[in-house]
Interface confidence: medium
């Protein structure tokens, strides 16, 4: 799981992904549900080695969160070829993995 620390790094990660699915976890240190799902998010990155997993701390990267129109914590967004292809909010493990399988 790659930690994104700037808007440039975020764009570079999307570009570098090519055709691969990119899953972005928008979270914050003060968010309880974010902490709860973090180990699961990391386990998915091992399970789905052909998918790119990114973490964005909304406090450290307000510009990325703003550009991606993140309105609440926790939000997951899904990108392919630089385009957003899915999004949902809430710390739901099943829906997170189901969405990856839908889009991979």
């Amino acid at each position: 799981v790659k930690q994104i620390e700037s808007k440039t790094a975020f764009q570079e990660a999307l570009d570098a992904a090519g055709d691969k699915l990119v899953v972005v976890d928008f979270s914050a240190t003060w968010c309880g549900p974010c902490k709860m799902i973090k180990p699961f998010f990391h386990s998915l990155s091992e399970k789905y080695s052909n998918v790119i997993f990114l973490e964005v701390d909304v406090d450290d990267c307000q510009d990325v969160a703003s550009e991606c129109e993140v309105k609440c914590m926790i939000t997951f967004q899904f990108f392919k070829k630089g385009q957003k292809v899915g999004e949902f909010s809430g710390a739901n493990k099943e829906k997170l993995e189901a969405t990856i399988n839908e889009l991979v």
Epitope: Y48, E94, A98, N101, E102
Partner: antibody
Framework: EVQLQQSGAELVKPGASVKLSCTAS????????MHWVKQRPEQGLEWIGR????????KYDPKFQGKATITADTSSNTAYLQLSSLTSEDTAVYYC??????????WGQGTSVTVSS | QIVLTQSPAIMSASPGEKVTMTCSAS?????MYWYQQKPGTSPKRWIY???KLASGVPARFSGSGSGTSYSLTISTMEAEDAATYYC????????FGAGTKLELK
């Protein structure tokens, strides 16, 4: 406890339509995808499609496109499967299912649909 | 769409016998799922993530495989294992195999 309660058996005429229901308890259907699966007598399982009740987004096996319509009503925590222009090929048991990735997943008891004149 | 081919379609085994059934996928998949179904009942999740046993499944069952080739094995057949077993993949368009009917000899 998670449960999926399906509507009762249906006997319908060829050419008619039927709408089956699946009411969930023990979880909010907005939190996951609801799937429908067909099983013809003495046959295997066929995935029809699924709905994301949070936004109404649906996906169908191409084989069932135009035949099946999946909808959901989040206020009653219920998913629906509508089948149109029924023929004898549609005679089957239809299951709603919460196909999870973990050790447990959940299936309704099935609804038998018989198409006969 | 990924096609799953199960073999054999029907098999019989005596109590205590080792049983192996296979499922071949038309394209590579990450994980296989297996269901057990007995007549007149809904399918039951039996194996998930290729090799993990679902809750309440006896330890005599095991699952293995990768890529396009997967299998379910029963180390020692018991009467209660007689059922139809379906493999299942969870890609963008989920599919099921046609099933292997396991009968008690």
């Amino acid at each position: 406890e998670v449960q999926l309660q399906q509507s009762g058996a249906e006997l319908v005429k060829p050419g008619a339509s039927v709408k089956l229901s699946c009411t969930a308890s023990g979880f909010n259907i907005k939190d996951t995808f609801m799937h429908w699966v067909k099983q013809r007598p003495e046959q295997g399982l066929e995935w029809i499609g699924r709905i994301d009740p949070a936004n109404g987004n649906t996906k169908y096996d191409p084989k069932f496109q135009g035949k099946a319509t999946i909808t959901a009503d989040t206020s009653s925590n219920t998913a629906y499967l509508q089948l149109s222009s029924l023929t004898s090929e549609d005679t089957a048991v239809y299951y709603c299912a919460l196909l999870q990735y973990s050790a447990m997943d959940y299936w309704g008891q099935g609804t038998s649909v018989t198409v006969s004149s | 769409q990924i096609v799953l081919t199960q073999s054999p379609a029907i098999m019989s085994a005596s109590p205590g016998e080792k049983v192996t059934m296979t499922c071949s996928a038309s394209s590579r998949i990450s994980y296989m799922y297996w269901y057990q179904q007995k007549p007149g009942t809904s399918p039951k999740r039996w194996i998930y993530d290729t090799s993990k046993l679902a809750s309440g499944v006896p330890a005599r069952f095991s699952g293995s495989g990768s890529g396009t080739s997967y299998s379910l094995t029963i180390s020692t057949m018991e009467a209660e294992d007689a059922a139809t077993y379906y493999c299942h993949q969870r890609s963008s368009y989920p599919t099921f195999g046609a099933g292997t009917k396991l009968e008690l000899k």
